[in-house]
Interface confidence: low
């Protein structure tokens, strides 16, 4: 397993609709054709997988149908969007990148993006 550097922003604030976007950039040591991107959430020293996608270079990322993540790729950058976030989902979101094919296998893990989610205030009653 060879190490690879992965960069991601330190802090991101989710929108009022519970959507957070950030860029995950990796320093590819070779010409990978198949890349796997995994988003991990670390909270209270527990690491859980949020979503994952494999993509062929130049193609779209394909997350599972029920995934809360979407994304696009451009060269060695992946633009990730996580939806449906609530205040309880605030935490450190870590980008894990694996260069799957061709060998050798490379693995890189970012330092994480702290995503802050603030639940919107309920709207007051209105006659409109």
């Amino acid at each position: 397993c060879k190490a690879m550097h992965v960069a991601q922003p330190a802090v991101v604030l989710a929108s009022s609709r519970g959507i957070a976007s950030f860029v995950c950039e990796y320093a590819s040591p070779g010409k990978a054709t198949e890349v796997r991107v995994t988003v991990l959430r670390q909270a209270d020293s527990q690491v859980t997988e949020v979503c994952a996608a494999t993509y062929m270079m130049g193609n779209e990322l394909t997350f599972l149908d029920d995934s809360i993540c979407t994304g696009t790729s451009s060269g060695n950058q992946v633009n990730l969007t996580i939806q449906g976030l609530r205040a309880m989902d605030t935490g450190l979101y870590i980008c894990k990148v694996e260069l799957m094919y061709p060998p050798p296998y490379y693995l890189g893990i970012g330092n994480g993006t702290q995503i802050y989610v603030i639940d919107p205030e309920p709207c007051p009653d209105s006659d409109f």
């Epitope: 997988e49 296998y105 693995l107």
Partner: antibody, heavy 122, light 107 residues
Framework: EVQLVESGGGLVQPGGSLRLSCAAS????????MSWVRQAPGKGLEWVAT????????SYPDSVKGRFTISRDNSKNTLYLQMNSLRAEDTAVYYC???????????????WGQGTLVTVSA | DIQMTQSPSSLSASVGDRVTITCRAG??????LAWYQQKQGKSPKLLVY???TLAEGVPSRFSGSGSGTQFTLTISSLQPEDFATYYC?????????FGGGTKLEIK
């Protein structure tokens, strides 16, 4: 219920070949990365080979690289391990194992078969 | 390859005892560690993954902890069915390697 049943083990001479099979049931086989793990008599566990869901990616440790080939037939729900140029040190129980879920590649082995014994001896 | 070292290699304990098994990784593997139990003549069974998450159906007397390079598997109160060999395994990249095992025997 997840079931993995290995077959094809037996006695083979050094330099010989053997093909192991693993019949899978109780889950959607094509959705999961699969592996082979072996255990020499009285020894610990050693990962042997891994194949991705569609079969496009395979991985091996140096100890078997170039001699062993992992493959799968998703239409038959079957995993294979073709072992060539066998050596005495390949003697072991070979387990078929399923990764925990299909959405990641490098993970733990959540389900194991009962194993099949391969003995390499003159 | 990442070297995984387990200690002790064997351990004698009694029913009801609290037992701790240690696994050390040769480099930082974050929380990418799994524990397995193997009874004599049987295939291994997953106990813990991601260092501390119990696999489905595993009794709560088992617990995993640690991150980085130091990990532990604890059995809070040994039951007769817990006497077996325990293995750790990293799942931080390939090749995945196992510890040498810890054989837990009845005192």
């Amino acid at each position: 219920e997840v079931q993995l049943v290995e077959s094809g083990g037996g006695l083979v001479q050094p330099g010989g070949s053997l093909r192991l099979s693993c019949a899978a049931s109780g889950f959607t086989f094509s959705s999961y990365t699969m592996s082979w793990v072996r255990q020499a008599p009285g020894k610990g566990l050693e990962w042997v080979a891994t194949i991705s869901r569609g079969g496009g990616y395979t991985s091996y440790p140096d100890s078997v690289k170039g001699r062993f080939t992992i493959s799968r037939d998703n239409s038959k729900n079957t995993l294979y391990l073709q072992m060539n140029s066998l050596r005495a040190e390949d003697t072991a129980v070979y387990y078929c194992a399923r990764e925990d879920y299909g959405s990641s590649y490098v993970h733990w082995f959540a389900y194991w078969g009962q194993g099949t014994l391969v003995t390499v001896s003159a | 390859d990442i070297q995984m070292t387990q200690s002790p290699s064997s351990l004698s304990a009694s029913v009801g005892d609290r037992v701790t098994i240690t696994c050390r990784a040769g480099e930082n593997i974050y929380s990418y560690l799994a524990w397995y139990q193997q009874k004599q003549g049987k295939s291994p069974k997953l106990l813990v993954y991601n260092a501390r998450t119990l696999a489905e159906g595993v009794p709560s007397r088992f617990s995993g902890s640690g991150s980085g390079t130091q990990f532990t598997l604890t059995i809070s109160s040994l039951q007769p069915e817990d006497f077996a060999t325990y293995y750790c395994q990293h799942h931080y990249g390939s090749p995945r390697t196992f510890g040498g095992g810890t054989k837990l025997e009845i005192k």
